[in-house]
């Protein structure tokens, strides 16, 4: 078990130009706090996975009002450390958010509003008991000076908070075997509780005869590097030679995740999703409320009136989650109508819509026909976003302008000639023909074979086509 | 909107036992705790049982006018609450409602039990 | 166990303010017992007006607000109306146990 600690040395417009409007002014006094965000491993920083070594907010700084025309200064810090207890080993190698937020002091209807001005992210290796480590990190225009270290609480010390130390029983010398606690000199090694054999360097124990493994660490004495990468199954221990995950405890069994918290196993180790007002590696951590500000990306903070849901976040547009810390695809929903091509921008949605719709989701057909004529008596069909116009017989293209050649195709069959005629065309068919289009031919007997004539007409009179 | 019906009161003798259900559409009933809560003829309004959601292993509280005699329980599959009743009292006589706690309160339009020799 | 106080019966004119209050015998209220105001009206009619201390219910009226007033919860109605009156009751959450208040008349004349 342990502390980290972030010291916030600075907050203020970086290096070079653009520098940022100062974020409170005469007319809406605010101030600063701070929430950092810890995560084991390499993790990546997320802002929507758990934090599941743990999270801390500051307390409030003073109030601050910009003096009109001056450039934004650094910015009064809130007084204190940011401290995140961890119960467990600390890992060694940790990822980190820490967002500045700006509490808004002026007449706000139900109470002070908050914004995030800026989050800044890393993934750091660090040894606990070491000394302060300094960061600098840029967000936009803002800069962020800190600095932060890991220590152990007694009676845990070592580089991940695992070897338990305690005040010699004899003045001179620890016990046989145990080794003084460095740099707690007149402090000795406690006597081994762990399972025999346990890793000193990669198993950790909480309970006399258990070992427990570091992260990237197996086997029943934490002895085996993981290595997933010729395994067929996800759990865990199996020989010390390959590194093999094969089927044993999975990390979830008991299920360590506690308030409710649900456990789902990750490659290496396992993760807790929290019910709401729960965090920490284990859900152990509880009693958030509003007034810690538990609320990402500027969701607005309410009561709750039961305990298990102690607060409620109103996310806004783009977010979601109990705490609006998942940002919504809101693309994956299909906002756009008829085939639109959907942008995220973050702060809205736009649809670029294809030829022929437009509106915000593409939702409005346009009239193709709008304002388009076609011509010589051709009539406006709208169709699928675009038009088209049916001409008149003896016209074509895309208006109707063209006049046509209805002979060019060649419609009269067996020989026929074909004439152009006012209102279409007319074959003259070749004898032993007859028909609109020649199709038909005239049995020697004088007969069709199909239709009949029609009345008032001989076979191989020319016959025009309506 | 959230809708609460409850159903299952009626007239029951003493030492007798009684079923009450309550229905829950238009929210998503796994994730919250439900209670019951009821109000005895002319009087104010007293919390009877309380179960959590499948997060917290579905754990049970009582007031304990009613523990041992009480059962509360949930079927998140159907979205319905219920609370059985046994060795049932004079006292117990109350419109029962169905109370889901989240922003605020909801409650059902209640169902009467009548516990009566 | 907690017993949770109010006052038994008010009486306020129309476009006055009043307030009601809730005491916990177990120490000062909190924003950790989700203070929650019902109100009833004739017929067994309950409405949830606030929840967690200060939450105002939709579609209830703004003149109907929330708070933790020294170390009670209390009620305000800011400009009272004479449909306003009811009986309002507060419960108090104690970790899982609610305890409910007697409730408040409140006559609007």
């Known amino acids: 078990a342990g502390v980290f600690e972030l010291q916030i040395h600075s907050f203020g417009p970086g290096p070079g130009p653009g520098a940022p409007r100062s974020p409170c002014s005469a007319r809406l006094p605010c101030r600063l706090f701070f929430r950092v965000c810890l995560k084991p491993g390499l993790s990546e920083e997320a802002a929507e996975s758990p934090c599941a070594l743990g999270a801390a907010l500051s307390a409030r700084g003073p109030v601050y009002t910009e003096q009109p025309g001056a450039p934004a200064p650094d910015l009064p810090l809130p007084d204190g450390l940011l401290q995140v207890p961890f119960r467990d080993a600390w890992p060694g190698t940790f990822s980190f958010i820490i967002e500045t937020w700006r509490e808004e002091l002026g007449d706000q209807i139900g109470g002070p509003a908050w914004s995030l001005l800026a989050r800044v992210a890393g993934r750091r290796r660090l040894a606990a008991g070491g000394p302060w480590a300094r960061d600098i990190q840029r967000a936009g225009a803002w800069e962020l000076r800190f600095s932060y270290r890991a220590r152990c609480e007694p009676p845990a010390v070592g580089t991940a908070c695992t070897r338990l130390c305690r005040p010699r029983s004899a003045p001179s010398r620890c016990g046989p075997g145990l080794r003084p606690c460095a740099p707690l000199e007149d402090e000795c090694e406690a006597p081994l509780v762990c399972r025999a054999g346990c890793s000193p360097e990669h198993g950790f124990c909480e309970q006399p005869g258990e070992c427990r493994c570091l992260e990237g660490w197996t086997g029943p004495l934490c002895t085996v590097p993981v290595s997933t990468s010729s395994c067929l199954s996800p759990r865990g221990p199996s020989s010390a030679t390959t590194g093999c995950l094969v089927p044993g405890p999975g990390p979830c069994d008991g299920n360590p995740c506690a308030n409710g918290g649900s456990c789902s196993e990750t490659p290496r180790s396992f993760e807790c999703t929290c019910p709401r007002g729960f965090y920490g590696l284990r859900c152990e951590v509880s009693g958030v409320t509003c007034a810690d500000g538990p609320c990402f990306n500027g969701g607005l903070c309410v009561g709750g009136a039961d305990p298990d849901s102690a607060y409620i976040c109103h996310c806004p547009p783009g977010f979601q989650g109990s705490n609006c810390e998942k940002r919504v695809d809101r693309c994956s929903l299909q906002p756009c109508r008829n085939g639109g091509l959907c942008l995220d921008l973050g702060h809205a949605l736009r649809c670029r819509c294809r030829a022929g719709f437009a509106g915000p989701r593409c939702e409005h057909d346009l009239d193709d026909c709008a304002g388009r004529a076609c011509a010589n008596g051709g009539t406006c069909v709208e169709g699928g976003g675009a038009h088209r116009c049916s001409c008149a017989l003896g016209f074509g293209g895309r208006d109707c302008r063209e006049r046509a050649d209805p002979c060019a195709a060649r419609p009269c069959a067996h020989g026929g000639r074909c004439y152009a005629h006012f209102s279409g065309l007319v074959c003259a068919c070749a004898p032993g023909y007859m028909g609109a289009r020649c199709e038909f031919p005239v049995h020697p007997d004088g007969a069709s074979a199909l239709p009949a004539a029609p009345p008032g007409l001989r076979p191989g009179d020319p016959q025009r086509y309506l | 909107e959230v809708q609460l019906v409850e159903t299952g009161g009626g007239l029951v003798q003493p030492k007798g036992s009684l079923k009450l259900s309550c229905a829950v559409s238009a929210f998503t009933f796994t994730t919250y705790a439900m209670n019951w809560v009821r109000q005895a003829p002319g009087k104010g309004l007293e919390w009877v049982a309380r179960?959590?959601?499948?997060?917290?292993?579905?754990?049970?509280y009582y007031a304990d006018s009613v523990k041992d005699r009480f059962t509360i329980s949930r079927d998140d599959s159907q979205s319905m609450l219920y609370l059985q009743m046994n060795n049932l009292k004079i006292e117990d006589t109350a419109m029962y409602y169905c109370?889901?706690?989240?922003?605020?309160?909801?409650w059902g339009q209640g169902t009467l039990v009548t516990v009566s020799a | 166990q907690a017993v949770v106080t109010q006052e038994s019966a008010l009486t306020t004119s129309p476009g006055e303010t009043v307030t009601l209050t809730c005491r916990s015998s177990?120490?000062?209220?909190?924003?950790?017992?989700?203070a929650n105001w019902i109100q009833e009206k004739p017929d067994h009619l309950f409405t949830g007006l606030i929840g967690?201390?200060?939450n105002r219910a939709p579609g209830v009226p703004a003149r109907f607000s929330g708070s933790l007033i020294g170390d009670k919860a209390a009620l305000t109605i800011t400009g009272a109306q004479t449909e306003d009156e009811a009986i309002y009751f507060c419960?108090?959450?104690?970790?899982?146990?609610?305890?409910f208040g007697g409730g408040t008349k409140l006559t609007v004349l």
């Open positions: 177990t120490g000062a209220v909190t924003t950790s017992n989700h």
């Open positions: 419960g108090l959450w104690y970790s899982n146990h609610l305890v």
């Open positions: 179960i959590r959601n499948h997060s917290n292993n579905y754990a049970t």
């Open positions: 109370v889901f706690y989240y922003d605020y309160v909801y």
């Open positions: 967690g201390t200060n």
